[in-house]
Interface confidence: medium
């Protein structure tokens, strides 16, 4: 079996996690992609996903999560803005490829969010001069209901009722139409 590797990010409340997941261009460019959280002993929960088929560099926003799929570069950009301590956890990017199980992209991301104003860009409103505007047309894409049992971290759930739908995600409050976000973190 492939060893599951993790990358750890330690950020302060209010900062932005800004990471990318690489994928094989030819194979997955237009495939639907998702950002998931993995809780111990549970199936991965899908927090946000791109449209189906995935649109090139078209931002999809779900609460404080913004996904952008750069087809020409084989990367999915994932941002979680205004981080909260409760956002700490293990995350992964996956590619939906029905009828097969989702394909997991490496590495997983171990996010540690700690309290306290960091004073670093991403933590407040003047973090960057370029204002990133979420287009008003940005919609919440419908995400498939299935997840992969291969990514369970401990025991699998007792029944399929534990598999989350997009509406039973962790609580991510909505942000305003204008979000100032850093580029590198």
């Amino acid at each position: 079996a492939t060893k599951l590797t993790e990358e750890k990010y330690e950020l302060k409340e209010g900062q932005t996690l800004d990471v990318k997941c690489d994928y094989t261009l030819e194979k997955f460019a237009s495939s639907q992609k998702a950002w998931q959280i993995i809780r111990d002993g549970e199936m991965p929960k899908t927090l946000a996903c791109t449209e189906r088929p995935s649109k090139n560099s078209h931002p999809v926003q779900v609460g404080r999560i913004i996904l952008e799929d750069y087809h020409d570069h084989g990367l999915l950009r994932v941002r979680m803005v205004n981080l909260q301590v409760e956002d700490s956890g293990l995350y992964q990017c996956v590619i939906y490829q029905p009828p097969k199980e989702p394909h997991m992209l490496f590495d997983r991301i171990r996010l540690v969010v700690t309290k306290g104003f960091s004073g670093t860009p991403g933590s407040n409103e003047n973090s960057t001069q370029n204002v990133y505007k979420i287009p008003p047309t940005t919609t919440k894409a419908l995400c498939p209901l299935y997840t992969s049992p291969r990514t369970v971290t401990q025991a699998p759930p007792k029944s399929t009722a534990d598999v989350s739908t997009p509406d039973s995600e962790i609580n991510l409050t909505n942000v305003t139409d204008i979000i100032r976000v850093p580029v590198f973190n």
């Epitope: 990358e7 750890k8 990010y9 330690e10 950020l11 302060k12 900062q15 800004d18 990471v19 990318k20 997941c21 690489d22 994928y23 094989t24 750069y70 570069h73 084989g74 990367l75 950009r77 490496f106 590495d107 991301i109 540690v112 700690t114 960091s118 670093t120 860009p121 991403g122 973090s127 960057t128 001069q129 370029n130 990133y132 976000v181 850093p182 580029v183 590198f184 973190n185």
Partner: antibody, heavy 127, light 107 residues
Framework: QVQLVQSGAEVKKPGSSVKVSCKAS????????ISWVRQAPGQGLEWMGG????????NYAQKFQGRVTIAADEPTSTTYMELRSLRSEDTAVYYC????????????????????WGQGTTVTVSS | DIQMTQSPTSLSASVGDRVTITCRAS??????LAWYQQKPEKAPKSLIY???SLQSGVPSRFSGSGSGTDFTLTISSLQPEDFATYYC?????????FGQGTRLEIK
């Protein structure tokens, strides 16, 4: 691997602006993040800001916020750093540096550390 | 901002010596740390990224270790060309910050 070539030395008056360019060659321009770092005479390194050309948005250190603009021109693979309202303490060597952030199996982070540096541009601010 | 503190600030050593430079972050930065070497009138050169990964083309006598807040750069056997100033740098979060530098001189 990408190479970075910077524009030549500049002598400026206090209150004026300077625009330094950094041209990349030998790599895919928008697969890198470009940072600007300065070093005053006899001092250490100070990060000013950076840009990922693919995404277009720049980010700046709070100290330089409102006084610096970093921009990228993809067709010419060139990044620019403009510093306004110059004062004598801005006298320094200004470096651009590239961070490779793309590739299968690489880090999820965009920013790796500054793996390739330009030769530096000396900016002297004097009346 | 994350403060990076290097020690010592200067160091005298001889060719063949084993040298260790430490860098401490004011808060946890996982493994998001890089080390650079700079010689007078030259641009810095990247030695180590992600705390312990050697940049391509850098001699294996250079090594890095640590995670969280405490990091170390080790030169196992000093060569004449290694006398320079060394900087650590964090890139866990903005603003990216450097240590104040460690000047390595010939004894």
């Amino acid at each position: 691997q990408v190479q970075l070539v910077q524009s030549g030395a500049e002598v400026k008056k206090p209150g004026s602006s300077v625009k330094v360019s950094c041209k990349a060659s030998g790599g895919t321009f928008n697969r890198h993040a470009i940072s600007w770092v300065r070093q005053a005479p006899g001092q250490g390194l100070e990060w000013m800001g950076g840009i990922i050309p693919l995404f277009g948005t720049a980010n700046y250190a709070q100290k330089f916020q409102g006084r610096v603009t970093i921009a990228a021109d993809e067709p010419t693979s060139t990044t620019y750093m403009e510093l306004r309202s110059l004062r004598s303490e801005d006298t320094a060597v200004y470096y651009c540096a590239s961070s490779y952030f793309y590739g299968s199996g690489s880090s999820n982070y965009y920013y790796y550390g500054l793996d390739v540096w330009g030769q530096g541009t000396t900016v002297t601010v004097s009346s | 901002d994350i403060q990076m503190t290097q020690s010592p600030t200067s160091l005298s050593a001889s060719v063949g010596d084993r040298v260790t430079i430490t860098c401490r972050a004011s808060q946890g930065i996982s493994s998001w740390l890089a080390w650079y070497q700079q010689k007078p009138e030259k641009a810095p050169k990247s030695l180590i990224y992600a705390a312990s990964s050697l940049q391509s083309g850098v001699p294996s006598r250079f090594s890095g270790s640590g995670s969280g807040t405490d990091f170390t750069l080790t030169i196992s056997s000093l060569q004449p060309e290694d006398f320079a100033t060394y900087y650590c740098q964090q890139y866990n979060s903005y603003p990216i910050t450097f240590g104040q530098g460690t000047r390595l001189e010939i004894k």
